[in-house]
């Protein structure tokens, strides 16, 4: 554990001003596993001025970071890139003159406390004003910045020309496409400062490529996979002040596939279990020994679970006998195609 600090299996705290620390605390190899550290508390460290890009990355489990009454002046943009579990940050009473939202945009923070820092009034910190305005009143902090006259000014009163939130607009509000086909999405962004445009495609499986020029962007998705049905695609405009996004849900239409059909199992009823994928929802028809199976209250199809474009169910049979032994074929069809799958069922005798 670094000098002036104390360490436990989950916590590091550095509060002794003397001799103090000049760099962010790092654990010695073969000591405590940094991944298990959930809280770091630093106080009274006047010589701690910088958090570098790689200082915090080892603490992937970190939830609470507190640096108070210290000399923190600069935080590298990518300092918290690997710390996706961070929920609470407290940088009260440090020497921060600026702080970008780029530090925190990927984090799901519950608290970001920044009171008592000598921020410079500029567009760079306008995002903090916007953040304050979106918070409910009990959570707001008294934040100030120094104007050109070196006067303290409440951040709530900050007015900077040509410094506002951007906007993003997608051309396609809803997007329905057939599996295997391609589609191009267009997006336009605007704002001052001029925003950058990027696409958030989440875990899209289909091959995609984007082209961006200034305020226009296009995303081409090719050979669209049925696995991408229901996924959201967003066009994001981002500048110093904040971001705006416009989203579209992708609906992929595709022919049915019976991915699972098994021999009957007995529970409360007998059940021939199946799973069918398809969009739009496939119509199901059973055949028994090649002939149409006439469903009734004693033999009927039940869908138990619907998972977007996947349907899990049973052909439910009440008290089947040897008369029900034979080949059962499930046919699933929609306007994009069909599939059949057969099993042999032996109930008794």
């Amino acid at each position: 554990c670094p000098t002036s600090c104390k360490c436990s299996s989950a916590r590091i705290w550095c509060t002794e001003p003397s001799p103090g620390i000049v760099a962010f605390p790092r654990l010695e190899p073969n000591s405590v596993d940094p991944e298990n550290i959930t809280e770091i508390l630093i106080a009274n460290q006047k010589r701690l001025e910088i958090i570098n890009e790689d200082d915090v990355e080892a603490y992937v489990g970190l939830r609470n970071l507190t640096i108070v009454d210290s000399g923190l002046k600069f935080v590298a943009y990518k300092a918290f890139l690997k710390n996706s579990n961070l929920r609470h940050i407290n940088f009260t009473r440090n020497k921060l003159t600026s702080l970008s939202r780029r530090h925190f945009r990927h984090l799901d923070l519950s608290d970001l406390i920044l009171t008592g820092n000598p921020f410079t009034c500029s567009c760079d910190i306008m995002w903090l004003k916007t953040l304050q305005e979106t918070k409910s009143s009990p959570d707001t902090q008294d934040l100030y910045c120094l104007n050109e006259s070196s006067k303290n000014m409440p951040l709530a009163n900050l007015q900077i020309p040509n410094c506002g939130l951007p906007s993003a607009r997608l051309a396609a509000p809803n997007l329905t496409v057939e599996e295997g086909k391609s589609v191009t999405l267009s997006c336009s962004v605007g704002g001052d400062p001029l925003p950058t445009l990027y696409w958030d495609v989440g875990n899209l499986v289909s091959k995609h490529m984007n082209e961006t020029s200034h305020t226009q962007g296009s995303l081409r998705i090719t050979n669209i996979s049925s696995d991408d049905s229901g996924k959201q695609i967003s066009c994001v405009a981002e500048n110093l002040v904040g971001e705006d996004q416009d989203s579209v849900n992708l609906t992929v239409h595709f022919a049915p596939t019976i991915t699972f059909l098994e021999s009957p199992t007995s529970d409360h009823h007998w059940c021939i279990p199946f799973t069918v994928r398809g969009n739009p929802k496939p119509a199901l028809q059973w055949f028994y020994n090649g002939a149409i199976l006439n469903e009734s209250k004693y033999i009927c199809t039940k869908i138990h679970v619907t998972n977007h474009t996947e349907y899990h169910g049973c052909l439910q049979l009440d008290n089947p006998t040897h008369m029900n032994n034979g080949d059962y074929t499930l046919m699933a069809k929609n306007e994009y195609g069909k599939d059949e799958r057969q099993i042999s069922a032996h109930f008794m005798g």
């Epitope: 991915t259 028809q285 090649g290 149409i292 006439n294 046919m331 069909k338 599939d339 059949e340 799958r341």
Partner: antibody
Framework: EVQLQQSGPELVKPGASVKISCKAS????????MNWVKQSHGKSLEWIGD????????SYNQKFKGKATLTVDKSSSTAYMELRSLTSEDSAVYYC????????????WGQGTTLTVSS | DIVMSQSPSSLAVSAGEKVTMSCKSS????????????LAWYQQKPGQSPKLLIY???TRESGVPDRFTGSGSGTDFTLTISSVQAEDLAVYYC????????FGSGTQLEIK
């Protein structure tokens, strides 16, 4: 022996309706879908629609929606197709055909019913 | 809608000769899971109803002579008659059953 026996030829006036029958024998009507197919003189075959005789569920070729209505009478093992608002374009031979192999293929066909629409 | 195109529209051959006719679909008729093609061939002799010859693109219907062979996959299919007989005079239609049902325009086979 499986047989599909269709009703005889029809001569009707434009604007009228007609109901063609198809009586199934040699098998249980409710075991197979019944399909209807149109063949205009010297032309190819066009699928009109099919019916599940168990529950009366139908599907139609979009072109024939509103023109054809398919029904069955299980007690007499007979399938019917009604054609309405007839025009000369409806003059053709109409076949019923049994849907086999999970209703993908038509293994038995009726002998055809000739419909002539003329004033 | 799936469009079925047949060629040639007609052909004339002598008895004993081999004949092939083609059927193309506007989209694939292949079920990628089962590897089955939803394609059939029908024979319609003059004044008669159509008769099922081949289903699943290559399975011969019972009672159909083995000189009739179906082949192909996806979008391109062929019906071959290895040694044409006089009684094979007919129109031959292909039909898809992957999305509803569509017939081709037919190939008229004449015997010289």
């Amino acid at each position: 022996e499986v047989q599909l026996q269709q009703s005889g030829p029809e001569l009707v006036k434009p604007g009228a309706s007609v109901k063609i029958s198809c009586k199934a024998s040699g098998y249980t009507l409710t075991d197979y879908y019944m399909n209807w197919v149109k063949q205009s003189h010297g032309k190819s075959l066009e699928w009109i629609g099919d019916i599940n005789p168990n529950n009366g569920g139908t599907s139609y070729n979009q072109k024939f929606k509103g023109k054809a209505t398919l029904t069955v009478d299980k007690s007499s093992s007979t399938a019917y197709m009604e054609l309405r608002s007839l025009t000369s374009e409806d003059s053709a031979v109409y076949y019923c055909a049994r849907g086999a192999y999970y209703s993908n293929y038509f293994d038995y066909w009726g002998q055809g019913t000739t419909l002539t629409v003329s004033s | 809608d799936i469009v079925m195109s047949q060629s040639p529209s007609s052909l004339a051959v002598s008895a004993g000769e081999k004949v092939t006719m083609s059927c193309k679909s506007s989209q694939s008729l292949l079920n990628s899971r089962t590897r089955k093609n939803y394609l059939a061939w029908y024979q319609q002799k003059p004044g008669q109803s159509p008769k099922l010859l081949i289903y699943w693109a290559s399975t011969r219907e019972s009672g159909v002579p083995d000189r009739f062979t179906g082949s192909g996959s996806g979008t391109d299919f062929t019906l071959t008659i290895s040694s044409v007989q006089a009684e094979d005079l007919a129109v031959y239609y292909c039909k898809q059953s992957y999305i509803l049902f569509t017939f081709g325009s037919g190939t008229q086979l004449e015997i010289k």
